[in-house]
């Protein structure tokens, strides 16, 4: 189970913030109907990544990837899949 | 649906103390350079964002978690 499949819009926003690209951030925030104050708040987080440079973005991306692919998350994803299968079977 | 561990990480990034956030990161990646970077980013966010900003960021996260795209 790929991490982005569990909640693609979260990873779109996270990538846009960590990547430092305002155009991508705006586009992803549009898709969740973010308000102007919400956009301002997300841009402040984005500023921190930009100010701390490429290494900072890579390292934090590594953390997010590690958490998303950890047994805590993968176990959850597998459990959800099992539950879905049970429901589908019962549904028949 | 978003994984609870990811949700916890993001919540602590916004609302936790630097120590709480770094401790959470350490559970998954205990490299000194990673933990130092986590602390730098957390300190930066705390310095830049007002309480209202943090509430707005949490509001975005709520919208993300309840989105059909999640």
């Amino acid at each position: 189970v790929k991490m982005a499949e569990t909640c693609p819009i979260f990873y779109d926003v996270f990538f846009a913030v960590a990547n430092g690209n305002e155009l991508l951030l705006d586009l992803s925030l549009t898709k969740v109907n973010a308000t102007e104050p919400e956009r301002t708040a997300m841009k402040k987080i984005q500023d921190c990544y930009v100010e701390n440079g490429l290494i900072s973005r890579v390292l934090d991306g590594l953390v997010m990837t590690t958490i998303s692919s950890s047994k805590d998350c993968m176990g959850e994803a597998v459990q959800n899949t099992v539950e879905d299968l049970k429901l589908n079977t019962l549904g028949r | 649906e978003i994984c609870p561990a990811v949700k916890r990480d993001v919540d602590l990034f916004l609302t936790g103390t630097p120590d709480e956030y770094v401790e959470q990161v350490a559970q998954y990646k205990a490299l000194p350079v990673v933990l130092e970077n986590a602390r730098i980013l957390k300190n930066c966010v705390d310095a830049k964002m007002t309480e209202e900003d943090k509430e707005n960021a949490l509001s975005v996260l709520d919208k993300i978690y309840t989105s059909p795209l999640c």
């Epitope: 430092g20 690209n21 305002e22 155009l23 991508l24 705006d26 586009l27 925030l29 549009t30 898709k31 109907n33 973010a34 956009r39 930009v50 | -």
Partner: antibody, heavy 120, light 107 residues
Amino acid sequence: EVQLVESGGGLAQPGGSLRLSCAASGFTFNNYAMTWVRQAPGKGLDWVSAISDSGRSTFSADSVKGRFTISRDNSKNTLYLQMDSLRAEDTALYYCAKHRNWNYPVFDYWGQGTLVTVSS
Amino acid sequence: DIQLTQSPSFLSASVGDRVTITCWASQGISSYLAWYQQKPGKAPKLLIYSASTLQSGVPSRFSGSGSGTEFTLTISSLQPEDFATYYCQQLNSYPFTFGPGTKVDIK
């Protein structure tokens, strides 16, 4: 009244360079992302490049990546397109356009265009 | 990149006709689609965004519909000033792309 006026087009040799400008007026320039769109003679519209309101972030079509650079000077209300390593297929009318707003980036105002011809 | 196709590419119609142009996206783009009108020698003009929202100042005879991968632009009663080329554009993801255009000509 919103106005966008392009300049800097002309004849260039293959491999040569040109710098296009777009002077903006009638709106708060530094509040809006901006875009360049081109149209080859008798052809359709081709999105080239966009830049965020602050000028910090850009995005370009693969066909121009590494050759064209979009930039802006918010103090001068001016958008630029630096075109290097020009090719014959870059021959087109180049339009600058304003994004409607950050949360729906359609192009609500366009300039009249400046013609770029690449030929030896 | 998301590809857009338009049908028809050329359309002959008379004043008063109801005209429909279709735009297909190569993948789902929700309602992130706009329509532009371009007359010869002029810059494009925004007609519709968000698939169905009419841009300020655009006559109500223009309407848009659709979501996902199929969209339509309808002109309820064609007027002499509507003879032009119409382009759809996706704004779901960068790079933004345009359809190839539909030329509406006088029959």
